[in-house]
């Protein structure tokens, strides 16, 4: 069964800067990745970035840099101040779509006990939705 993992890290140098990494553990080819915060996209979450493997990347503030790390993983750097700044308990969600086979989504937030700049290796997060 395909799985999605999400890793959130606060940068030690900039406390308002977050790095979100997401990956897809499965055999399907990815047609679109959507990254949102505040909950799953389509369920109250706000889209931060959308990545297409061939057509490019779209991103919205406070997203600073979204990119593909591998064919099945992406990273997104957020930086913000004031109202647009993420906080420690912000939930970030990644949805990997493989049209028309299905889509898989998982969410994560900063580990409560983590020090800035330190993070555990990514582990599969609970799958919230699988079509």
């Amino acid at each position: 069964t395909p799985e999605v993992w999400v890793q959130v890290r606060m940068e030690a140098t900039e406390l308002s800067s977050f790095t979100i990494r997401c990956g897809f553990l499965g055999s399907g080819s990815i047609s679109l990745v959507t990254v949102s915060w505040g909950g799953p996209n389509g369920a109250g979450g706000t889209t931060l970035a959308v990545l297409h493997p061939e057509r490019g990347i779209r991103q919205w503030a406070p997203a600073r840099q979204a990119r593909w790390e591998t064919q099945s993983s992406i990273s997104l750097i957020l930086e913000g101040s004031g109202a647009s700044s993420p906080c420690a308990n912000t939930t970030f969600c990644c949805k990997f779509a493989s049209f028309p086979e299905g889509s898989w989504e998982a969410c994560g937030s900063l580990p409560p006990s983590s020090d800035p700049g330190l993070s555990a290796p990514p582990t599969p997060a609970p799958i919230l939705r699988a079509d």
Epitope: L32, S36, G42, G45, A97, S103
Partner: nanobody
Framework: EVQLVESGGGLVQPGGSLRLSCAAS????????MGWFRQAPGKGLDEGVA????????KYADSVKGRFTISHGNAKYILYLQMNSLRAEDTAVYYC??????????????WGQGTQVTVSS
């Protein structure tokens, strides 16, 4: 949870018409396009039979221009596809999808289970 539900498919003779409908529920949509995509038996997915973006711009695949018409219902999350002068090569599973525009192309982020359209005498 996002749900897109298609209806209106079926068996029709060549030259006939069908109207597909798509209803979205549980949806707080932040994408910028919706459309109809299809997959014929044993073939790959069509890039987009007919799509419409939030600005109302409509795009049709060359193979359906002048025969198919995409439109929204009274609500933003109702989508229709009027298919006229149907041909055997239109036989496929038709998917309603919502997504994001890249380079003028609508890329699906959410979609329904699909509805079968068969054109045969």
């Amino acid at each position: 949870e996002v749900q897109l539900v298609e209806s209106g498919g079926g068996l029709v003779q060549p030259g006939g018409s069908l109207r597909l409908s798509c209803a979205a529920s549980g949806y707080s949509y932040s994408g910028d396009c919706m459309g109809w995509f299809r997959q014929a038996p044993g073939k790959g997915l069509d890039e987009g039979v007919a799509t419409i973006d939030n600005a109302g711009r409509i795009k049709y695949a060359d193979s359906v221009k002048g025969r198919f018409t995409i439109s929204h219902g009274n609500a933003k999350y109702i989508l229709y596809l009027q298919m006229n002068s149907l041909r055997a090569e239109d036989t496929a599973v038709y998917y309603c999808a919502a997504g994001w525009t890249f380079g003028g192309q609508c890329s699906p982020a959410d979609w329904g289970q699909g509805t079968q359209v068969t054109v045969s005498s």
